[in-house]
């Protein structure tokens, strides 16, 4: 199979093979027509919703018979519903007082727009990236990171928050998307799947990667997140896909080796400071960028997403540790913690490199590239 146009950049390598999505996000119904985040990851599309062959918003699954088959609801991790009477065994139980709609979850009720109306917005994340439709923008310069190489002290808080594993970052990590577009890193977290089921949030031509890292930043124009929510450019996220490689990733091992300590929902531990930039791809010059939203409630829009073209390699054992160690609400494993891809609704994804120029023999017909919106910057 042909590699999607995630370039095989050394040293960390590129994308792995994936199916072509026969329909672009632009053709999908708007978020208001069919908000999809209430669907469990992997749930089959409802009639009339998308019903497309090759739709890969959903995790790949090998049915027990090893034959091709559709994913059934019983294959999904069970999550204790609000109000379930049983007391979980792992001491991470449902809050009984204030059991309102704010306790959202992946793959079940309540529907996210009921939790936060912004989740039904038109410019949501994540999205499927189709490099052939990306607009090459020479104005998108290499990302600049300063202060990301942290000393061992002070230690950092690593927490299982029931939705992900989150590392809170100290002050002083500066990131620039370009001149005058300066940010401060706040925290990083991961999204993953389950055994044999990929769990990245963004996809490339319908291909879902094993996992994805998000480093969340606040614009220097704002003092606090609550001021920046929903403001264009107020928040920026650096995202990178995690793939399986032959060797252990020593940077990630500094975090993954501590996951056992925070297996229970709500638990936290202190980890020595580390080189945060080592968790990201080495090539800061090749990336995709678009404006979207937070991928969890309240789903606030105006978030600048920068998705690296280069991927990060972890060993099979490390990816297994990531997806098989933590517990979420009730007695459910913390797995498949990704939101389905959302319609672009006319948005154009920009690329800092000519991603649409396909040198492979498959590119028989001419490709119509979108124009670069940032050309006048």
């Amino acid at each position: 199979q042909r590699l999607p146009r995630m370039q095989e950049d050394s040293p960390l390598g590129g994308g792995s093979s994936g199916e072509d999505d026969p329909l672009g996000e632009e053709d999908l119904p708007s978020e208001e027509d069919s908000p999809r985040e209430e669907d469990p990851p992997g749930e089959e599309d409802l009639p009339g919703e998308e019903d497309l062959p090759g739709e890969e918003d959903l995790p790949e699954v090998k049915p027990k018979s090893e034959e091709e088959g559709s994913l059934k609801l019983e294959d999904l991790p069970t999550v204790e519903a609000p109000g379930d009477p049983q007391e979980p065994q792992n001491n991470a139980h449902r809050d009984k007082e204030g059991d309102d709609q704010s306790h959202w979850r992946y793959g079940g009720d309540p529907p996210w727009p009921r939790v936060s109306p912004a989740c039904a917005g038109r410019f949501q994340s994540p999205v499927d990236i189709r490099p052939q439709l990306a607009a090459f923008c020479p104005a998108l310069r290499p990302l600049e990171l300063l202060g990301f190489q942290l000393p061992p002290l002070p230690e950092l808080r690593l927490r299982n928050n029931g939705h992900s594993v989150q590392l809170t970052l100290p002050p002083g990590l500066e990131m620039a998307l370009g001149p005058g577009r300066e940010y401060r890193a706040l925290q990083l977290h991961l999204h993953w799947g389950a055994a044999g089921r990929p769990g990245s949030e963004h996809t490339v031509e319908g291909h879902r990667f094993p996992a994805e890292i998000h480093v969340v930043h606040l614009s220097t124009a704002f003092a606090r997140v609550d001021e920046a929510l929903g403001r264009p450019g107020g928040l920026a996220v650096l995202a990178a896909f995690l793939e399986e490689g032959p060797e252990e990733n020593s940077a990630y091992e500094q975090l993954l080796s501590r996951l056992e300590e925070i297996a229970e929902e709500g638990s936290e531990t202190q980890v020595p400071g580390l080189d945060i930039s080592a968790l990201l791809p080495s090539d800061f010059s090749r990336y995709f960028q678009y404006e979207g939203s937070l991928t969890t409630p309240p789903c606030a829009q105006g978030v600048i997403w920068t998705v690296f073209n280069q991927t990060v390699m972890l060993s099979a054992k490390q990816l297994h540790t990531l997806s098989d160690t933590l517990w979420g609400p009730g007695d459910s494993r913390l797995q498949l913690n990704f939101r389905a891809t959302q319609p672009l609704n006319g948005r154009v994804i920009e690329a800092s490199f000519p991603a649409g120029v396909d040198s492979s023999p498959r590119a028989a017909e001419p490709v119509q590239l979108n124009s670069c919106l940032a050309a006048g910057d």
């Epitope: 809050d95 928050n161 606090r224 929902e265 606030a300």
Partner: nanobody, 117 residues
Framework: QVQLVESGGGLVQPGGSLRLSCSAS???????????VAWYRQAPGKGLELVSV???????KYSDSVKGRFTISRDNSKNTLYLQMNSLRAEDTAVYYC????????WGQGTLVTVSS
Amino acid sequence: QVQLVESGGGLVQPGGSLRLSCSASGNSANIFSFASVAWYRQAPGKGLELVSVITSAGGTKYSDSVKGRFTISRDNSKNTLYLQMNSLRAEDTAVYYCNVDYLQDYWGQGTLVTVSS
């Protein structure tokens, strides 16, 4: 601006009870209900210790030293976090801080709890 204001601290005898409250104001309506919220404490001459947390997913967790005696709860309609403390001991004496964690940490100014006869 999000402001977290703790209240309910004071002097109590061993075996007694207190209820701490942490009220969030300002833009907190945007974030409180989506945040993990927690109580930390700092005893004299000691480091910061996590007492209890309610995660954004709704689960609760307690440190071993308070399990069975303390109960954490939240009321998102009031943007308020609570900590019911029963069977208090001298070693519970500390400044208790409210923490709201939504992409970044928000902290209260702390309320002093003194357990002494």
